[in-house]
């Protein structure tokens, strides 16, 4: 705006424009004309910095003349009214429309007027997230996926986590001329404590009212890791029975529990259930290491426990087991 | 080249109208704005009005609003000022002047011969 | 009523330099005044020399140009030539009127 009192006319419009990829947007462009300032707009001229000639121009007498008429409008300029408004609407915006435009006024007397707006071409692009299934490598890979597709310009992808790792991002092409595809994978050495934990990936454009969030629920696959619980060290003889505990962690689930001792197969006081162990009372002490062997799409693995059952009062303790 | 011929001297009676006109040769007439400026006997200059020839749109000098009236005929690429309710103050050489654009800005750039009114009884 | 004052006289040796100047009784003249100098010599018609303050007008010579000093419009002369004897008329706008100046002879002498 100009100072109070300068009386003179002024073209106002944005400094830059967005529209959509294949959408039409409107170029606003406004004759500001204070209240005692006689003026008289004789054309209206569109043009586009470093291309010859005008791409639309409205002429008092004439009316519109368009370089592409299937592509430009005047949204308000009218025959027989005063021409103000040089508003300008383009049709399936192309990539290639991207880049500064001048709209002028020749008003009389006072000149010619202009401004220049930046059309910036956008295309919203589409973003899925995935996990990448992996199993326990010892090295940094992959576990994460996250793709922006067909932005314009690039989206930025950042990612959130308390796992640590870091990103590897890339560029494509995108399946429309002019966007672009980002692809963001989260890498990290897999392990078992990662397994069912999330990593989420922000995605930012400018067609977006905020960043896109995306989650990822992470899946390792690790062979079982097992032990055994249930046993407090206050086991005595002649005593309610009591169950030992099979606990296995593992990606897949354990598709089996296998019950043994290191002297081989279960005494006749212990019965296998499950992930389950069923120790019965017992009338002399004993002293046995049980093993839990637990397998898994990707392996077995086993864990060893020895118990005692001890001679001691039985009035103090009601069974062999704490629980 | 461009040109601006003037019709000849006028004299006139108080209370009459006269009707002077311009025309334009060398340039497209439609496109052009015409202002009509005068000079009284011993007196500086004094713009009237102004009018697009395309449209017939005109802008008056307030002092003439109601005594002037500015057309244009197109297919004889003409300018006419008519004055009414002539009075002896009046007198002066009329001059019409096509205005040309100068980089971005407007100026008075060819201007006819001049056309002497005269009122008097 | 804006009235626009222009020196009624000047004088200039030929190849000297000389400044014309156009004041406006409303204040600092500015660019919104779009100011117009033309120029009519003895027995021709009106010619326009400079538009929207400082734009020469095409065909006239770069020893012509226009400017604001301070709070006046000016018209330049530099190298003056026997043949820009003339009496030089400025004209300004005020927002729906063109008021002219009462112009000055330019004598180079």
């Known amino acids: 705006w100009p100072p109070p009192g300068t009386g003179d006319i002024v073209v106002q419009a944005p400094t830059q424009v967005p529209g959509f990829l294949g959408d039409s947007v409107t170029l606003p462009c406004y004759l500001q004309v204070p209240g005692m300032e006689e003026t008289h707009v004789s054309q209206l001229t569109w043009s586009r910095h470093g291309e010859s000639g005008s791409m639309a121009v409205f002429h008092q007498t004439q009316g519109p003349n368009y370089s592409e008429p299937k592509r430009l409008e005047f949204v308000a300029a009218r025959l027989g009214t005063e021409l103000r408004d040089a508003s300008l609407r383009m049709f399936g915006l192309r990539v290639e429309d991207e880049g500064n435009y001048t709209c002028l006024f020749v008003a009389f007397p006072q000149g010619s007027r202009s401004v220049d707006i930046w059309l910036r071409v956008l295309a919203k692009p589409q973003n899925t997230a995935e996990v990448q299934k992996v199993q326990l490598t010892g090295k940094p890979v992959p576990v994460a996926r996250c793709v922006s597709t067909g932005g314009r310009p690039p989206a930025h992808i950042t990612w959130h986590s308390d796992l640590g790792g870091m990103p590897n991002t890339s560029q494509a092409p995108g399946f429309l001329s002019g966007t672009v595809t980002v692809t963001s994978l989260w890498i990290l050495v897999p392990s078992s404590q990662v397994d069912g934990k999330s990593v989420t990936c922000k995605v930012e454009h400018e067609s977006f009212e905020k960043p896109q969030l995306l989650t990822v629920n992470l899946t390792v696959y690790y062979p079982p890791e097992v032990s055994i619980s249930g046993y407090d060290n206050n086991w005595y003889l002649s005593q309610n029975e009591a169950t030992l505990t099979c606990d296995a962690r593992s990606n897949p689930e354990p598709t089996g529990y296998n019950w043994s001792t290191t002297m081989g197969p279960l005494p006749p006081f212990a019965v296998a259930q499950g992930a389950q162990l069923l120790i019965r009372p017992v009338d002399k002490p004993i002293n046995t290491t049980f093993i839990c062997n637990v397998t898994n799409a990707l392996g077995a693995r086993q864990a060893e426990l020895t118990v005692q059952v001890k001679e001691g009062p039985p009035s103090e303790h009601s069974g062999m087991s704490s629980n | 080249q461009v040109q601006l011929v003037q019709s000849g001297a006028e004299v006139k009676k108080p209370g009459a109208s006269v009707k002077v006109s311009c025309k334009a040769s060398g340039y497209t007439f439609t496109s052009s704005y015409i202002s009509w400026v005068r000079q009284a006997p011993g007196q500086g200059l004094e713009w009237i009005a102004w009018?697009?020839?395309?449209?017939?749109?005109?802008n008056y000098n307030q002092k003439f609003t109601g005594r002037v009236t500015m057309t244009t005929d197109t297919s004889t690429s003409t300018a006419y000022m008519e004055l009414r309710s002539l009075r002896s103050d009046d007198t002066a050489v009329y001059y019409c002047?096509?205005?040309?654009?100068?980089?971005?800005?407007?100026?008075?750039?060819?201007w006819g011969q001049g056309t002497t009114v005269t009122v008097s009884s | 009523q804006a009235v626009v004052t222009q020196e009624p006289s000047l004088t200039v040796s030929p190849g000297g330099t000389v400044t014309l100047t156009c004041r406006s009784s409303t204040g600092a003249v500015t660019t919104s005044n779009l100011a117009n100098w033309v120029q009519q010599k003895p027995g021709q018609a009106f010619r326009g020399l400079i538009g929207h303050t400082n734009n020469r007008a095409p065909g006239v010579p770069a020893r012509f140009s226009g400017s604001l000093l301070g709070d006046k419009a000016a018209l330049t002369l530099s190298g003056a030539q026997p043949e820009d004897e003339a009496e030089y008329y400025c004209i300004l706008w005020y927002s729906n009127k063109f008021v002219f100046g009462g112009g000055t002879k330019l004598t180079v002498l």
């Open positions: 009018i697009y020839a395309g449209t017939g749109d005109t």
């Open positions: 002047a096509r205005h040309g654009m100068t980089g971005r800005g407007w100026y008075f750039a060819v």
